[in-house]
């Protein structure tokens, strides 16, 4: 598989790695989201590990207000992070795509 | 970096790998998009390599109708593919996240 295809596969599998732990196996509850962010996106969270910070992230992602994050909401979130990364990328004129 | 962070990095770097080839270096024109899809997402395109198919994809992605695909439109597109992959994933009850 090409790197971009693998990237999409990682996005899907990471969601299900955590969504299946409690309750609705196709949605992330707050505990599952917290674990996903802490383990899989530590650079996004940084030092914001207090409860209120997680509640805010959860609230911002939960567009249908059901106290859970479904796959579509998760994709919107990752798109936002990618767009933030892209803004940084575009701000560095000579930046080459990072080699793996 | 964690796999999900690397996945986001691949999404950004893949876009710029092609967007910088012609014209606006922060947008994909039709030629660049065609090359990106053919080389980086062959499983998405499958056998649909005719001109009309590309025009259709381009039209669907180009939400602001400027005949180019910016990073946000590209993210929406990838989210749609991820959601299609996820529907397949959810349709297979015993499917484990694919190991890399």
């Amino acid at each position: 598989a090409r790197p971009l295809e693998e990237a999409l596969d990682v996005i899907v599998s990471t969601f299900h790695k955590y969504s299946g732990k409690e309750g609705d196996k196709f949605k992330l509850n707050k505990t599952e989201l917290k674990e996903l962010l802490t383990r899989e996106l530590p650079s996004f969270l940084g030092k914001r590990t207090d409860e209120a910070a997680f509640q805010k992230v959860m609230s911002n992602l939960d567009s249908n207000r059901d106290n859970e994050v479904d796959f579509q909401e998760y994709c919107v979130f990752l798109s936002c992070i990618a767009m933030m990364c892209n803004e940084f990328f575009e701000g560095c004129p000579d930046k080459e795509p990072r080699k793996k | 970096a964690r796999p999900l962070e690397e996945a986001l990095d691949v999404i950004v770097s893949t876009f710029h790998k092609y967007s910088g080839k012609e014209g606006d270096k922060f947008k994909l024109n039709k030629t660049e998009l065609k090359e990106l899809l053919t080389r980086e997402l062959p499983s998405f395109l499958g056998k649909r390599t005719d001109e009309a198919a590309f025009q259709k994809v381009m039209s669907n992605l180009d939400s602001n109708r400027d005949n180019e695909v910016d990073f946000q439109e590209y993210c929406v597109f990838l989210s749609c593919i991820a959601m299609m992959c996820n529907e397949f994933f959810e349709g297979c009850p015993d499917k484990e996240p694919r190991k890399k």
Epitope: G23, K30, A52, Q55, K56, S59, N60, S63, R65 | -
Partner: antibody
Framework: QVQLQESGPGLVKPSQTLSLTCTVS?????????WNWIRQFPGKGLEWIGH???????NYNPSLKNRLSMSRDTSKNQFSLKLSSVTAADTAVYYC?????????????WGQGTLVTVSS | DIQMTQSPSSLSASVGDRVTITCRAS??????LNWYQQKPGKALKLLLY???RLHSGVPSRFSGSGSGTDYTLTISSLQPEDFATYYC?????????FGGGTKVEIK
Amino acid sequence: QVQLQESGPGLVKPSQTLSLTCTVSGDSFTNDYYWNWIRQFPGKGLEWIGHIGYGGNINYNPSLKNRLSMSRDTSKNQFSLKLSSVTAADTAVYYCTRESFYDGYPFDYWGQGTLVTVSS
Amino acid sequence: DIQMTQSPSSLSASVGDRVTITCRASQDIRNYLNWYQQKPGKALKLLLYYTSRLHSGVPSRFSGSGSGTDYTLTISSLQPEDFATYYCQQGNSLPRTFGGGTKVEIK
């Protein structure tokens, strides 16, 4: 201390559009909260109307969706409600509220309410 | 929509009494249940959220319990300022819905 203040006409004619604005003070009108409209009928029953929040995301009560429009103006710390084709059944006290980001998204701050009467 | 049914619709009690109000949801609301107090001519005030968590500034005589579809608000020792109407509200899904209210009056 967060304060919410509703404003708008107290009397609206049947078939016209009810327009209300809520001004938020004492707190920045941030993305961390959803901003709601709730109404209380003369019989004291409460009905959630809808809200606007993160990224301009809007959710409406399906029972009112066809007549409802909500918007916000972050520069003025305001959000507003428009309810079209009103009838006497829309007579109520209208409250604007802030929806907290805590579990269950409770309404932690309320305006004092404004009575809207629909009558010719 | 999730229907919320409160009981009783009114009750009479004396200062110092223990008062219990119940709220039943038409389906499991996973503890996403909030309680409010309203005094005549005033807006509602949040008391408890997520079944049992006390909102800031609310006296500890107010407590909540329950799970699934059945929830309870308890006032351990009724005070003069507690005579009011109490509403439950589900925060589980949209549209948000409220109970019909319980009016607590002086006996």
